[in-house]
Interface confidence: low
């Protein structure tokens, strides 16, 4: 069974759908791509949607409002965090105050730091307005002291 | 280790309905949404859908709407896919796979054969 | 809903031989996923977010592409490689739709 990313994730709500995350690069030394032990760093950010409405729907995954937004937001990630280190993102969680997301970043140590993620993310604000129509603010970016080792066949949310 | 164990093969007769199981084990059911392939013999998989164990969302691939119902049971971190109206066309291997982009952990197969 | 195509449906290969299979999607998607399958057995994810090795995946392997062509390569066939592998594409809208499949035979 291939091993990916230990999972770490505190107990989801109404978002138990999470985005795909990706074992570290090969690197040439390496017949067989390493397993993974330690140098995951996540970070936990927040940020306000201010041009919906949080409704019902966005506790049921099964909606389209939900799955659309969800599919939205794993998207806007990828586009922002696509340089490499970026793993992957989990635990979407949707809250009333127009539409309050929260989620996890996973990226690998040392490529990021909380500064630069949040600064990126203010940087795409525009283009996720235009792309997604998402009016984004108060962004809120913190590292997530998660203690980490990596089980034998345990894994990042696909 | 990471287990997703499905129920064994079954032989059943056009137009009954059967469910097949996919029992979870070595991660905590609730964290991961749990997917449902359909592969014909000799064919490529197609995504029926999706549900969310904790608390019963499910998203259906439309072609397969009306056909298969997806349920949990938490306390048996178990998910399962009821199948309607057999035809000789379901006739397939049914996996569980855990996921939402991609699937990293898969059930190993279970045989459905419909034939009177 | 997404189409992928996989070419050749299928090919063999020589030990040590460089083996290249193409998927081609019906519009453009972010990453592509492959999965290696054996006979009897489930897929396997073999790599990810387009060009990603999965743990365990010896380094003879890479993947690459963008938009609507994709590729998987084998630098040096080996033996255990025969198997059907599979593309599969997540979008922003369902369905989840995998490649009809590269069968590679060792010769």
């Known amino acids: 069974t291939p091993t990916t990313l230990a999972s770490h994730s505190t107990k989801t709500d109404a978002s138990s759908t999470h985005h795909s995350s990706v074992p570290p690069l090969t690197s040439s030394n390496h017949s067989t791509s390493p397993q993974l032990s330690t140098g995951v760093s996540f970070f936990f950010l927040s940020f306000h949607i201010s041009n919906l409405q949080f409704n019902s729907s966005l506790e049921d995954p099964s909606t389209d409002y939900y799955q659309e937004l969800q599919r939205d937001i794993s998207e806007m990630f990828l586009q922002i965090y696509k340089q490499g280190g970026f793993l992957g993102l989990s635990n979407i969680k949707f809250r009333p105050g127009s539409v309050v997301v929260q989620l996890t970043l996973a990226f690998r140590e040392g490529t990021i730091n909380v500064h630069d993620v949040e600064t990126q993310f203010n940087q795409y604000k525009t283009e996720a307005a235009s792309r997604y129509n998402l009016t984004i603010s108060d962004v809120s970016v913190s590292d997530v002291p998660f203690p980490f080792s990596a089980q034998s066949g345990a894994g990042v949310p696909g | 280790e990471v287990q997703l164990q499905q129920s064994g093969p079954e032989l059943v007769k056009p137009k009954t309905s059967m469910k097949i199981s996919c029992k979870a084990s070595g991660y905590s059911f609730t964290d991961f949404t749990m997917n449902w392939v359909k592969q014909s013999h000799g064919k490529n998989p197609e995504w029926i859908g999706l549900?969310?164990?904790?608390?019963?969302?499910?998203s259906y691939n439309q072609k397969f709407k009306g056909k298969a119902t997806f349920t949990v049971d938490r306390s048996s971190s178990t998910a399962y896919m009821e199948l309607l109206s057999l035809t000789s066309e379901d006739s397939a291997v049914y996996y569980c796979a855990r996921g939402l982009t991609y699937f990293d952990q898969w059930g190993q197969g279970t045989t459905l054969t419909v034939s009177s | 809903q997404i189409v992928l195509t996989q070419s050749p449906a299928l090919m063999s290969a020589s030990p040590g031989e460089k083996v290249t299979m193409t998927c081609s999607a019906s519009s453009s998607v972010s990453y592509m996923y492959w999965y290696q399958q054996k006979p009897t057995s489930s897929p396997k994810p073999w790599i990810l977010l387009t060009s990603n090795l999965a743990s365990g995946v010896p380094t003879r392997f890479s993947g690459s592409g963008s938009g609507t062509s994709y590729s998987l390569t084998i630098s040096s066939m080996e033996a255990e490689d025969a198997a059907t592998y599979y593309c599969q594409q997540w979008n922003s809208k369902p369905p989840i739709t995998f490649g009809g499949g590269t069968k590679l035979e060792i010769k």
């Open positions: 549900i969310t164990p904790y608390n019963g969302g499910t």
